[in-house]
Amino acid sequence: KSSNEATNITPKHNMKAFLDELKAENIKKFLYNFTQIPHLAGTEQNFQLAKQIQSQWKEFGLDSVELAHYDVLLSYPNKTHPNYISIINEDGNEIFNTSLFEPPPPGYENVSDIVPPFSAFSPQGMPEGDLVYVNYARTEDFFKLERDMKINCSGKIVIARYGKVFRGNKVKNAQLAGAKGVILYSDPADYFAPGVKSYPDGWNLPGGGVQRGNILNLNGAGDPLTPGYPANEYAYRRGIAEAVGLPSIPVHPIGYYDAQKLLEKMGGSAPPDSSWRGSLKVPYNVGPGFTGNFSTQKVKMHIHSTNEVTRIYNVIGTLRGAVEPDRYVILGGHRDSWVFGGIDPQSGAAVVHEIVRSFGTLKKEGWRPRRTILFASWDAEEFGLLGSTEWAEENSRLLQERGVAYINADSSIEGNYTLRVDCTPLMYSLVHNLTKELKSPDEGFEGKSLYESWTKKSPSPEFSGMPRISKLGSGNDFEVFFQRLGIASGRARYTKNWETNKFSGYPLYHSVYETYELVEKFYDPMFKYHLTVAQVRGGMVFELANSIVLPFDCRDYAVVLRKYADKIYSISMKHPQEMKTYSVSFDSLFSAVKNFTEIASKFSERLQDFDKSNPIVLRMMNDQLMFLERAFIDPLGLPDRPFYRHVIYAPSSHNKYAGESFPGIYDALFDIESKVDPSKAWGEVKRQIYVAAFTVQAAAETLSEVA
């Protein structure tokens, strides 16, 4: 049978027809529709949006569209007992209180159900004490405080600036340092780009703007009460004391107007160096406590949020494959937002909507993809990737046997400078080839390819003439598919110029000011960057679902494995005497990488030569490609992180957003010089080298000739 069974359109025309059907004007219209009211997870408004999307995907022509619901732990402020922070005098009187809400943006003054800024899953509590400024609250910031400056955070309330690392890691670090509360704030150094006005006159964060966000340390567990299993009708739920990843100390976020009031009184130690100073007109003293005149004043937190088991809804759409219906290519992004979701997530959801519409149009004309495409609108991403994780837990047996690829579709933009891609090495060549076929939307690159503008603006640090492609970390819905299940994954969006814009993320991230107007006025008035992202995401899905041979190149994995082995060996070489003393050798890992390289090369040669008209051999070769990512999964998981099972990549233990290579070895080596029992510590390094070497060798063997 033809690989293009059930279609009357030639393969080349299919992709062109699909891409030509994508329209910027539709993405704009969908974004407007999705951003007029808040769609907080667990609310009626978000349930209604789920039903609307279900209905529209059916109209667009998908074969089936179902809601998948779960009852998961969410967190909300107490409506009658607001959260705030005070400065109190020696008599306990509150002489300053932080704001209870963000001033609403123009045109939104009468919108109800805007959740006030809060740190989701903070426990309740009213701690009071002296303040310690801890910079970004990174691991290295606490090392600086405790080891170099001899400042003890035990029993203190710490204030940390947002940025650099995931907020949950900041809270975990503060807890480990003995803090009794955490205040998170947005410093203008990180969230106010020079020369740009604050919203509504520009895209910068105003002083009253605040970043919401969860502060969990789930490590891939999903719903905190049902780790490993779906939160369905008959689920057994842990007690709250046994829940996964919940913080143990109160946490609350504030804007820089309020932060100024807390930081301007700080005394104690001066900042250790300029990297600890932000852009406020305050000394950035570390503390503890306030200066002489104010030394009797304390800070008090008032946190009354509650954790509640609440129903959430994913929308799952299916476009059945004509030839290999049991092979799934998944395009998923979340629907829930903190408030209006102008960028996060609806700039992504609008793109998914238009991709579904385009696929539906082709299907109505008689076309079907070769493989099944699943479309997902995830719920409760903002509360810990809950919707995607619960669905994957429920469907794990199908996914691990049938999952070809997962393409993530959260925010389409975080800037308008160039493309940004994070993906498995298996997709490098797919991304390169696709972007060479797409037009660049960038000024000054008219008539040039996206590949060309991307490579010029974001060059690879290793390979000249190629663009930078980053490792997958976490903090988004691909996590369960890639880190737990080992399904090849990727993500793409338009980003800022990291060279000139040093702020973290985009300034209005997770604030009330993330509106439709923010995107339409300041980021992408013509929606040309959104369209480009739709073409990249949609094009990847199209190729993955429709190409006869899967568009994966295993040789690219070989290249990065060598690079990662070099990197981890370089880290270990900082301890040459210990390596000698404890007989630590990386030879097994380098040998495995060498074998992988040779076997991958031979596999690629066979891939060029085999008889593609033989459906059994075709399926066999494609299965070897599909299961290669799966081969990097260790069923036992990483130490103390059972749901991070990928041996080559995991979210950094110090920053969930960042990817770490050979994470087991990396974590075993981290701060090893401070370990109480060096023999045990180096024994664990050796064990992790063994696990990594075995896994790489085992993965290589999956590419060998089968008999």
Epitope: E462, D566, D587, F590, K594
Partner: nanobody
């Protein structure tokens, strides 16, 4: 055959400078990170510096930061260590270490002795 050969060591007074070289042969030098390791008389091995593939990224042990600079010339297959403001405690045999694709085990040079003494 994969080989690393250090040179440039010698006796020097405190405060003066020396430049060590390490010539690589038998492998694609530009593809790999390279390291300088030292061993003071009667002491254990100590990492000094690492330079990554393209030469744009390097790292140093705290005790030499601001005084030593590692560099590489990929065209000449050579690694360098510029040592300024030398101190008595820098006295050691300096080894150049790398890994080559042809070799599973790390490759060490024979070392070059640096003696800092007044």
């Amino acid at each position: 055959e994969v080989q690393l050969v250090e040179s440039g060591g010698g006796m020097v007074q405190p405060g003066r400078s020396l430049r060590l070289s390490c010539a690589a042969s038998g492998f694609t030098f530009s593809s790999y990170a390279m390291h300088w390791i030292r061993q003071a008389p009667g002491k254990g091995l100590e990492w000094v510096a690492t330079i990554y593939q393209d030469g744009s990224e390097s790292e140093y042990v705290d005790s030499v930061k601001g005084r030593f600079a590692v560099s590489r010339d990929n065209a000449k297959n050579t690694l360098y260590l510029q040592m300024d403001s030398l101190r008595a405690e820098d006295t050691a045999t300096y080894y150049c270490v790398g890994r080559a694709s042809a070799s599973i085990t790390p490759v060490w040079g024979l070392g070059t002795l640096v003696t800092v003494s007044s």
